[in-house]
Amino acid sequence: MAVTACQGLGFVVSLIGIAGIIAATCMDQWSTQDLYNNPVTAVFNYQGLWRSCVRESSGFTECRGYFTLLGLPAMLQAVRALMIVGIVLGAIGLLVSIFALKCIRIGSMEDSAKANMTLTSGIMFIVSGLCAIAGVSVFANMLVTNFWMSTANMYTGMGGMVQTVQTRYTFGAALFVGWVAGGLTLIGGVMMCIACRGLAPEETNYKAVSYHASGHSVAYKPGGFKASTGFGSNTKNKKIYDGGARTEDEVQSYPSKHDYV
């Protein structure tokens, strides 16, 4: 019961986490700029992985996609890749974990198969969570680096003058969503891995089988010490070795030439 609960909870936590990673990846608010006032209008700028947006004090908002791939910073490309890998791994993990859930019966799937699938999905969730956390952290680091590099930066270009505007870019909501979602996916993955240990059978119980030995037709009879416990009809505390192939419930009631004290 505890295993089922752990597995189910791990699945739900991972599901929420992956939904969060998808949401963070699609959000525009990865970096937000403090309100910049100029003679025309107050401008609020925010950027995501896929487009950059500007909102004016009038409420008008314009978003432009990053249509070029070559002109984009390598770090931004890396963050995109990490987030997409995280989503793909998470989605595959969810698919695998659905079939691995103990509460869902699919044909005659054995517990060992479910255990393996649970472990696989757990590892996928852990890697997915780590990808999301890494992606968000790389972006955050890029923001911090850009802020310090842009401080008091001014240069002349093509006859005109280019001046860096001193407006601080802060961490957007998407970063926090990404960190939390990545953490949840990671926790869910760990829970799935813990559940896997409970699902895996500790030891395999084989049915008793007796074998005919060559030569004197001597066969070892499993459960031969059963009489010593005080149960069964053999009360002489004998080890029972029977030449015939019988089940363990057939206790010998007469002596034979193969009985040994």
């Epitope: 910049y36 950027q47 910073p73 280019v162």
Partner: nanobody, 120 residues
Framework: QVQLQESGGGLVQPGGSLRLSCAAS????????MGWYRQAPGKQRELVAG???????NYGDSVKGRFTISRDNAKNTVYLQMNSLKPEDTAVYYC??????????????WGQGTLVTVSE
């Protein structure tokens, strides 16, 4: 790197018209504000007109009703239509744009200026 290309300046008679244009190129994500400033000899640089992406405009007191600013967002270009020009409009006109040029990077870029002379 962001570059501005200004054009349209020249000599014009009082009461005449001129159209200035300024095109931005380079690493550009957004251009929230585009505008024109001018600086007459021995005077401070002053705002002529500015326009936001959404079309919000602001004009300097001395040019209201005579000058019209417009922009083409697709071409990252701003235009200044100057009508009923006066001798006191003589100045170097500078294009000014606020450019979001990268992740966490906002630049204020100035053009090299184009001279407008209003004279008989």
């Amino acid at each position: 790197q962001v570059q501005l290309q200004e054009s349209g300046g020249g000599l014009v008679q009082p009461g005449g018209s001129l159209r200035l244009s300024c095109a931005a190129s380079g690493s550009i994500f957004n251009i929230p504000v585009m505008g024109w400033y001018r600086q007459a000899p021995g005077k401070q640089r002053e705002l002529v007109a500015g326009i936001s992406t959404g079309g919000t405009t602001n004009y300097g007191d001395s040019v209201k009703g005579r000058f019209t600013i417009s922009r083409d967002n697709a071409k990252n270009t701003v235009y200044l239509q100057m009508n009923s020009l006066k001798p006191e409009d003589t100045a170097v006109y500078y294009c000014n744009v606020l450019v979001v040029s990268g992740i966490g990077s906002t630049l204020e870029v100035w053009g090299q200026g184009t001279l407008v002379t209003v004279s008989e």
